[in-house]
């Protein structure tokens, strides 16, 4: 099959990186500048994406593959190949439309990024506080009243094999 | 589920120093808090120390300005430092991961003897 569409379509034997180029007899032209194909077969070159202002490059485009965006310090990428780059905020905080603002008492953001979230509720699992919350932190919930019992085992997984030679304490 | 391992323990003399040590086999830091309990015989057991993934510490009461709690990122090691013990500071001390939802991990245990 690969044989017969190669006689009925000679544009299928330009490899990545080169065009079908029809205007001069369906030889496999290099992309020109600033142009990519990263398939074969192809009769143009894409346009390589150009990374301006608040993106900056990650990766060089190629012949044969297109530019990588990130974005610039104090920005992170959002979307499918950082399409858009938005704005960080401090932990403890949550970008609104009126800028970054504090968590508000109760919720929590350990990132630069996101929303805030509520702290978790330590209670509905009947597990107590164990360090409160903050900003910037979830609070951390102790371990169940059971597993605090005099008669708890010490071990809820089974504990790994030692090397030889060292016995368990 | 993380496999928690403590090594450390021994019999030691009151005022004595002794460094406990948890390894664990998974990244600590995605746990809300790694910590320390211990637990006499017959006794209920006993909050000791716990270290947060910002690095925040907490102790028990009976402990403060006595024990250290560390960790290391690297090596996935969380330590005790105990110093100035006291014979009622003698226990099985066993390292935790604690997770806000879900069941706690804790490792086998070390004993800690202190000898007056």
């Known amino acids: 099959f690969e044989r017969t569409r190669s006689l009925q379509d000679p544009c299928s034997n330009c490899p990545a990186g080169t065009f079908c180029d029809n205007n001069r007899n369906q030889i496999c032209s290099p992309c020109p500048p600033n142009s990519f194909s990263s398939a074969g077969g192809q009769r143009t070159c894409d346009i390589c994406r150009q990374c301006k202002g608040v993106f900056r490059t990650r990766k060089e485009c190629s012949s044969t593959s297109n530019a990588e965006c990130d974005c610039t310090p104090g920005f992170h990428c959002l979307g499918a190949g950082c399409s858009m780059c938005e704005q960080d905020c401090k932990q403890g905080q949550e970008l609104t439309k009126k800028g970054c603002k504090d968590c508000c008492f109760g919720t929590f953001n350990d990132q630069k990024r996101g929303i805030c979230r509520p702290w978790t509720n330590c209670s509905l699992d009947g597990k107590s506080v164990l360090v409160n919350g903050t900003k910037e932190r979830d609070v951390v919930c102790g371990p169940s009243p059971a597993d605090l019992s005099p008669g708890a085992s010490s071990v809820t997984p089974p504990a790994p094999a030692r090397e030889p030679g060292h016995s368990p304490q | 589920e993380v496999q928690l391992v403590e090594s450390g323990g021994g019999l030691v003399q009151a005022g004595g120093s002794l460094r406990l040590s948890c390894a664990a086999s998974?990244?600590?830091?995605?746990?809300?808090?790694m910590a320390w309990y211990r637990q006499a015989p017959g006794k209920q057991r006993e909050f000791v120390a716990v270290i947060t993934p910002d690095g925040t510490t907490k102790y028990g009461d009976s402990v403060k300005g006595r024990f250290t709690i560390s960790r290391d990122i690297t090596k996935n090691t969380v330590d005790l430092e105990m110093n100035s013990l006291k014979p009622e500071d003698t226990a099985v001390y066993t390292c935790a991961a604690l997770r806000n939802s879900g069941s706690t991990s804790w490792g086998q245990g070390t004993q800690v003897t202190v000898s007056s």
């Open positions: 998974g990244a600590i830091f995605s746990y809300n808090g």
